[in-house]
């Protein structure tokens, strides 16, 4: 977490404020969709336990050619310790149940927004 | 619009149980923090308990741990706090309150509250 | 627990007047998050409680802009800069920040 700023950072990002720009972005998203976000794609829904932000990220992923998720999907990189590459997938998928992207974006900003408001940043 | 209706209070005797409900209409409570807050007659408000009934989170103050049992039923939009072991001075209005549902930082709606009156 | 401690109890005072009160919390009231959730209500007789302030200092939508709130740490204040007839009520302080919640003993604001 301590790198999620990039290299134009200044400095370490804490994990409150990296989760704090991931939910701004969600946000964002939600509030600026006109379109079917992302065409309508279906992504595999997730389990919003531990580990989730891996989990997440294998799920939007594999949505390519979607550039409203591009900056989300740098970011869920900085929250997931390991490499994630499309088509992989963890136990946290709930594999029988896609959803919209719409509804995954809207499903995981208000878990974050909880884990915010009771300062569960990693 | 959004509202908070509270019902089920009322007269019980000492060592008597009630169980509280809150209605809630204009939002869907999963997508916020519900909390119980009390005040005795002539006293100040005393926070009781919060649910996420998204997860089933709760958190209590210690004073009503064992005490109080706060849940949430999804599918009726209502939330509950049961009350048990009652003596004189639980008596009380009990309010159901909102956090407000962006970054939840405080209680933007309440409900008119309920009034528990524990009495031999 | 973290206790906050408000005072006066009570204050008695006329419409126009400039009126403080103050909350103290026995610890800093400021979140894992970085945000203070330092609450100010207000309840008339009979009704619930409706909120003033929030996190400090913000105003909720609708309320007048004769209420004002500010401090930090431990130490908070509610300020009404020229009170008026529909402000003679309770004041209650609330911090949200850390488990279990809980609100100040209150200031009844009274004619003079």
């Known amino acids: 977490l301590t790198c999620l700023g990039g290299f134009a950072s200044p400095g370490p990002v804490p994990p409150s404020t990296a989760l704090r720009e991931l939910i701004e972005e969600l946000v964002n998203i939600t509030q600026n969709q006109k379109a079917p976000l992302c065409n309508g794609s279906m992504v595999w829904s997730i389990n919003l336990t531990a580990g989730m932000y891996c989990a997440a990220l294998e799920s939007l992923i594999n949505v390519s050619g979607c550039s409203a998720i591009e900056k989300t999907q740098r970011m869920l990189s900085g929250f997931c310790p390991h490499k994630v590459s499309a088509g992989q997938f963890s136990s946290l998928h709930v594999r029988d149940t896609k959803i919209e992207v719409a509804q995954f974006v809207k499903d995981l900003l208000l878990h974050l927004k909880k884990l915010f408001r009771e300062g569960q940043f990693n | 619009e959004v509202q908070l209706v509270e019902s089920g209070g009322g007269l019980v005797q000492p060592g008597g149980s009630l169980r509280l409900s809150c209605a809630a209409s204009?939002?869907?409570?999963?997508?916020?923090?519900i909390h119980w807050v009390r005040q005795a007659p002539g006293k100040g408000l005393e926070w009781v308990a919060r649910?996420?009934?998204?997860?089933?989170?709760?958190k209590y103050d210690p004073k009503f741990q064992g005490k109080a049992t706060i849940s949430a039923d999804n599918a009726k939009n209502s939330l509950y706090l049961q009350m048990n072991s009652l003596r004189a001075e639980d008596t009380a209005v009990y309010y159901c309150?909102?956090?407000?549902?962006?970054?939840?930082?405080?209680?933007?709606?309440w409900g008119q509250g309920t009034l528990v009156t524990v009495s031999s | 627990d973290i206790q906050m401690t408000q005072s006066p109890s009570s204050l008695s005072a006329s419409v126009g007047d400039r009126v403080t009160i103050t909350c103290r919390s026995s610890?800093?009231?400021?979140?894992?998050?970085?945000?203070?959730?330092l609450e100010w209500y207000q309840q008339k007789p009979g009704k619930a409680p409706k909120l003033l302030i929030y996190?400090?200092?913000n105003r909720f939508s609708g309320v007048p802009s004769r209420f004002s709130g500010s401090g930090s740490g431990t130490d908070f204040t509610l300020t009404i800069s020229s009170l008026q007839p529909e402000d003679f009520a309770t004041y209650y302080c609330?911090?949200?920040?850390?488990?279990?919640?809980?609100f100040g003993g209150g200031t009844k604001v009274e004619i003079k």
């Open positions: 309150a909102r956090s407000e549902e962006n970054w939840y930082d405080f209680f933007d709606y």
């Open positions: 204009g939002f869907n409570i999963k997508d916020t923090y």
């Open positions: 649910i996420d009934p998204a997860n089933d989170n709760i």
């Open positions: 610890q800093s009231i400021v979140h894992s998050n970085g945000n203070t959730y």
């Open positions: 996190k400090v200092s």
């Open positions: 609330f911090q949200g920040s850390h488990i279990p919640y809980t």
